[in-house]
């Protein structure tokens, strides 16, 4: 399956925080989305192979890495002024 953690996260002003996403499905592609209240999902970043990733529609204030196939952590940087949202990680073949 695919596992995201933590379930809830509070960020202090000026801090970077990292959201974990792990999958054991042998999927090449992984994605991070953000959903704000009353809105649809918006793509932040996606990765299609190890050590390669592309910006989505709202990458500003976020960073990612893809050091291994199973993992695609998202860092919400201090530059992200409005981080409060629902974050969703996904993967696909």
């Amino acid at each position: 399956g695919i596992t995201q953690s933590p379930k809830y996260l509070f960020r202090k002003e000026g801090q970077n925080v990292t959201l974990s996403c792990e999958q054991n499905l042998n999927h090449d592609a992984m994605y991070w989305y953000r959903q704000d209240p009353g809105q649809g999902l918006r793509l932040i970043y996606y990765s299609q192979i190890v050590n390669d990733f592309q910006k989505g529609d709202i990458a500003e204030g976020y960073s990612v890495s893809r050091e291994k196939k199973e993992s695609f952590p998202l860092t919400v940087t201090s530059a992200q002024k409005n981080p409060t949202a629902f974050y969703l990680c996904a993967s696909s073949i």
């Epitope: 090449d28 192979i49 190890v50 050590n51 390669d52 592309q54 291994k68 993992s71």
Partner: antibody
């Protein structure tokens, strides 16, 4: 900052096995990425030999696959190249290398290179 | 294997010149994920190659803006807009779309 350093004999006899080791510092080879061996012939041409992945899986150049083994020692944070049945055509500078974050498979962390001569 | 053919093999130019090196692959370098894994390296004598451009057109960290890459499919170009003395070196293209990863034969850029 990832640093790589090759070690091993500079002279190998024909028909013997070439053995080189790459010691990695600044990053654990089990944490991610691909750990490559690349060689450069005296005429300056570059050839990718193969890699060992963070999970221990391998990918080899088919032209060398029957003679090459890339393995690792995770306790020492090292990975190694063995090339059997060498001939003078295997004389080259051998580099270990790994990709820079986010570049796909493009490598930019290189060892200093070790010159291997095959001669009796 | 994918053959990578660079031209010219050698090139004489002067400081301030605009220089273009081309690289042609024997098959398309577009990966099944639609990315193109074509890279350019610079090598100076006695040193390991250094990454200049990755994925066709992305300048690697610390690489001056006078270096640029372009192209698609099978035809790619490295351009140096205004040659500096430190740019005289050998340049290689490389592909990592298909295994085995392969390199061009190199272009030696010399001072005129």
């Amino acid at each position: 900052q990832v640093q790589l350093q090759e070690s091993g004999p500079g002279l190998v006899k024909p028909s013997e096995t070439l053995s080189l080791t790459c010691t990695v510092s600044g990053y654990s080879i089990t944490s991610g990425y691909f750990w490559n061996w690349i060689r450069q012939f005296p005429g300056k041409g570059l050839e990718w030999i193969g890699y060992i992945s963070y999970d221990g899986s391998n990918n080899y150049n088919p032209s060398l696959k029957s003679r090459v083994t890339i393995s690792r020692d995770t306790s020492k944070n090292q990975f190694s190249l063995k090339l059997s049945s060498v001939t003078a055509a295997d004389t080259a500078v051998y580099y270990c290398a790994s990709p820079s974050p986010g570049t796909g498979y493009a490598v930019d962390y290189w060892g200093q290179g070790t010159t291997v001569t095959v001669s009796s | 294997d994918i053959q990578m053919t660079q031209s010219p093999s050698s090139l004489s130019a002067s400081v301030g010149d605009r220089v273009t090196i081309t690289c042609r692959s024997s098959q398309s370098l577009v990966h099944s994920n639609q990315n193109t894994y074509l890279h350019w390296y610079q090598q100076k004598p006695g040193k390991a190659p250094k990454l200049l451009i990755y994925k066709v057109s992305n300048r690697f960290s610390g690489v001056p803006s006078r270096f640029s890459g372009s192209g698609s499919g099978t035809d790619f170009t490295l351009t140096i807009s205004s040659l500096q003395p430190e740019d005289f070196a050998t340049y290689y293209c490389s592909q990592s779309t298909h295994v085995p990863f392969t390199f061009g034969q190199g272009t030696k850029l010399e001072i005129k």
